[in-house]
Interface confidence: medium
């Protein structure tokens, strides 16, 4: 139904807390390199606004658009040429042209420094003197890294993150109570990130279609007993949810998703017996609860998939009628007899079948064309699982920073044209899926190593296409989203590039490393590591872990050496001299 | 939007008969298999009759074989379901679904009550 003030309309829906989250969210995506301070000040103005449209639906300005208003607000800032060089140019354009070139200009890798966490002590004071400001830092800072961050997922983040500060700054061990928690959010955090980033791009590159083929896979391996008019109906939903989040509507997309987990929760008996833990809990945990439960006990005798889908003489004439309708449905049949399938084997999988017929009702014979369909689904199947197999066995092997090392020569020979910050943070990221899923139980393998590569990889093509050095990079991914993790697997040894000069200054170390966390001393050796690799791309194995092994040792005897500095400056070119040798 | 409308149950004595029907739109009905599936209060769905897109293969649970007989209209856009010699466990609450399966369906279902 319209609503005479948008604004008013979102802020009664979401309430003065969520509504200011959300706003301070939005600008902090947009204009990602200004302070906490200056977002605020618009976040309260904006607020301010709202409550006058809540009085008064009539009053000036209140009947204007989402994006005219929240872009008004973001043209008015002083300085924006010279902090945002051509983003300022949005701001001659009209709505829904500056909208659209806003979005245009987020920066997937804007030069911010880390996200340092301060000291427990100096946290929790911060956090007691001033909950809601803290809050409000987290949020800015965590959109401004993350420009496509899923808006009502990060205030739940940050509703656990003030949950969690309120336990362990009570406690006496504020330290102890409050590093595990807040990394274990931290990591959660990152993964939903990198998943939301994917959708976004699926729906940037290939629309609407795509990101609904994606959801109605998802959600009949997670409701496998809704029928397919069910599916079909929260898949909709939720491919406007995601459109409005990556589009920036941000304050549409959390009602929506409020909406979307009302209702689910309202009809759970024609959805899932699972439900019900989830819809117990209050708005934002319950949302979170509903896009991760557990999959539905998938009904008995289902009847093999052939029946409709390859045996039935009407298998073309179906076909033809509604092609959307009757491949949605295939999808469907399909993934709810197999939750143990990643989604995008899934789409895969469909793609396949939709070649088929697209080939074989062509033909003087359709049935002896397509009869054979099921079994050519064979090697698309075997290919992630012996991907699965292979990766799990040797992070078994070889430990969390083993398999990193690993999949860092890998990539590294793949694409060596790549800078190395950014394959050490791909190699990193890659090298979790281990942690992540290979403990897992079997049947859930697969879904969750390719389903969680397939983000990772999204986001190496995503920094690739900023500075495109790589071919075999760009034809991976330009490719469809579901064939990049295939393509990227299929890689080998790029013969075209010539190695790079040996540097002696690219491995020597100084003292100061031994004082470094143990993650940052790791990225420095990896660091070190893919270096070496674009040196000699094809290095044995052997080779390289001679290496490796070398420089370990020389840091682990130089940070516990009495003068470190001495060590580091004498025993340092014996090193280079020794790693050249090796690698002759 | 796909929707189903079911609709034609009621309360009956053993042995009495009673014909439900579906009604198909948003999406193009005489290209899909379609079934009936029953539940029971706090039971998972169970599968009772199924028929493809052309109305010319139909198939049944044993339990309703011989008594219950499913059929289309394609140019109505309805499915229809009659059942004879219904028996008290027939007791349950009957919607149909799109393909051939079983599952949970957004349509409220009919309530077909069996007893004397």
């Known amino acids: 139904e319209a609503h005479k003030s948008e604004i008013a309309h979102r802020y009664n829906d979401l309430g003065e807390q969520h509504f200011k989250g959300l706003v301070l969210i939005a600008f902090s995506q947009y204009l990602q390199k200004c302070s906490y301070d200056e977002h605020a000040k618009l976040v309260q103005e904006v607020t301010d606004f709202a409550k006058t449209c809540v009085a008064d639906e009539s009053a000036a300005n209140c009947d204007k658009s989402l994006h005219t208003l929240f872009g008004d607000k973001l043209c008015a800032i002083p300085n924006l040429r010279e902090n945002y060089g051509e983003l300022a140019d949005c701001c001659t354009k009209q709505e829904p042209e500056r909208n659209e070139c806003f979005l245009q200009h987020k920066d997937d890798n804007p030069s911010l420094p880390p996200f340092e966490r301060p000291e427990a002590e100096a946290m929790c004071t911060s956090f007691k003197e001033n909950p809601t400001t803290f809050m409000g830092h987290y949020l800015h800072e965590v959109a401004r890294r993350h420009p496509y961050f899923y808006a009502p997922e990060l205030l739940y983040y940050a509703e656990q993150y003030n949950e969690i500060l309120t336990q362990c700054c009570a406690e006496a061990d504020k330290e102890s109570c409050l590093t595990p928690k807040l990394d274990g959010v931290k990591e959660k955090a990152l993964v939903s990130s990198v998943r939301q980033r994917m959708k976004c791009s699926s729906m940037q590159k290939f629309g609407e279609r795509a990101f609904k083929a994606w959801a109605v896979a998802r959600l009949s391996q997670t409701f496998p007993n809704a029928d397919f008019a069910e599916i079909t109906k929260l898949a909709t939903d939720l491919t406007k949810v995601n459109k409005e989040c990556c589009h920036g509507d941000l304050l549409e997309c959390a009602d929506d998703r409020a909406e979307l987990a009302k209702y689910m929760c309202e009809n759970q008996a024609t959805i899932s017996s699972k439900l019900q833990t989830c819809c117990d809990k209050p708005l934002l945990k319950k949302a979170h609860c509903l896009s991760e439960v557990e999959h539905d006990t998938m009904p008995a005798d289902l009847p093999a998939i052939a029946a409709d889908f390859v045996e039935d003489q009407e298998v073309c004439k179906n076909y033809a009628e509604a092609k959307d309708v009757f491949l949605g449905t295939f999808l469907y049949e399909y993934s709810r007899r197999h939750p143990d399938y990643s989604v995008s084997l899934l789409l895969r999988l469909a793609k396949k079948y939709e070649a088929t017929l697209e080939k074989c009702c062509a033909e003087a014979n359709p049935p002896a064309c397509y009869g054979t369909v099921l079994a050519e689904f064979q090697p698309l199947v075997e290919e992630p699982k012996n991907l699965v197999k292979t990766n799990c066995d040797l992070y078994e092997k070889l430990g969390e920073y083993g398999f990193q090392n690993a999949i860092l020569v890998r990539y590294t020979q793949k694409a060596p044209q790549v800078s190395t910050p950014t394959l050490v943070e791909a190699a990193r990221n890659l090298g979790r899926v281990g942690t992540k899923c290979c403990t897992l139980p079997e049947d859930q393998r697969l879904p969750c190593v390719e389903d969680y590569l397939s983000a990772i990889l999204n986001r190496v093509c995503l920094l690739h296409e900023k500075t495109p050095v790589s071919e075999h990079v760009t034809k991976c991914c330009s490719g469809s989203l579901v064939e990049r993790r295939p393509c990227f697997s299929a890689l080998t040894v790029d013969e075209t590039y010539v190695p790079k000069e040996f540097k002696a200054e690219t491995f020597t170390f100084h003292s100061d490393i031994c004082t470094l966390p143990e993650k940052e001393k790791q990225i420095k050796k990896q660091t070190a590591l893919a270096e070496l690799v674009k040196h000699k791309p094809k290095a044995t194995a052997e080779q390289l872990k001679t290496v490796m092994d070398d420089f370990a040792q020389f840091l682990d005897t130089c940070c516990k050496a009495a003068d470190k500095d001495t060590c580091f400056s004498t025993e340092g070119p014996n090193l280079v001299t020794r790693c050249k040798d090796a690698l002759a | 939007a796909v929707q189903l409308v079911d609709s034609g149950g009621g309360l009956v004595q053993p042995g009495g008969s009673l014909r439900l029907s579906c009604a198909a739109s948003g999406f193009s009905f005489g290209s899909f298999g379609m079934s009936w599936v029953r539940q029971y209060p706090g039971k998972e769905p169970e599968w009772v009759s199924s028929i493809n897109g052309r109305g010319d293969d139909t198939r049944y649970a044993d339990s309703v074989k011989g008594r219950f007989s499913i059929s289309r209209d394609n140019a109505k856009n309805t499915l229809y379901l009659q059942m004879n010699s219904l028996k008290p466990e027939d007791t349950a609450e009957y919607y149909c679904?799109?393909?051939?399966?079983?599952?949970?369906?957004r349509t409220q279902g009919t309530q077909v009550t069996v007893s004397s």
């Open positions: 679904t799109i393909g051939r399966s079983v599952s949970r369906s």
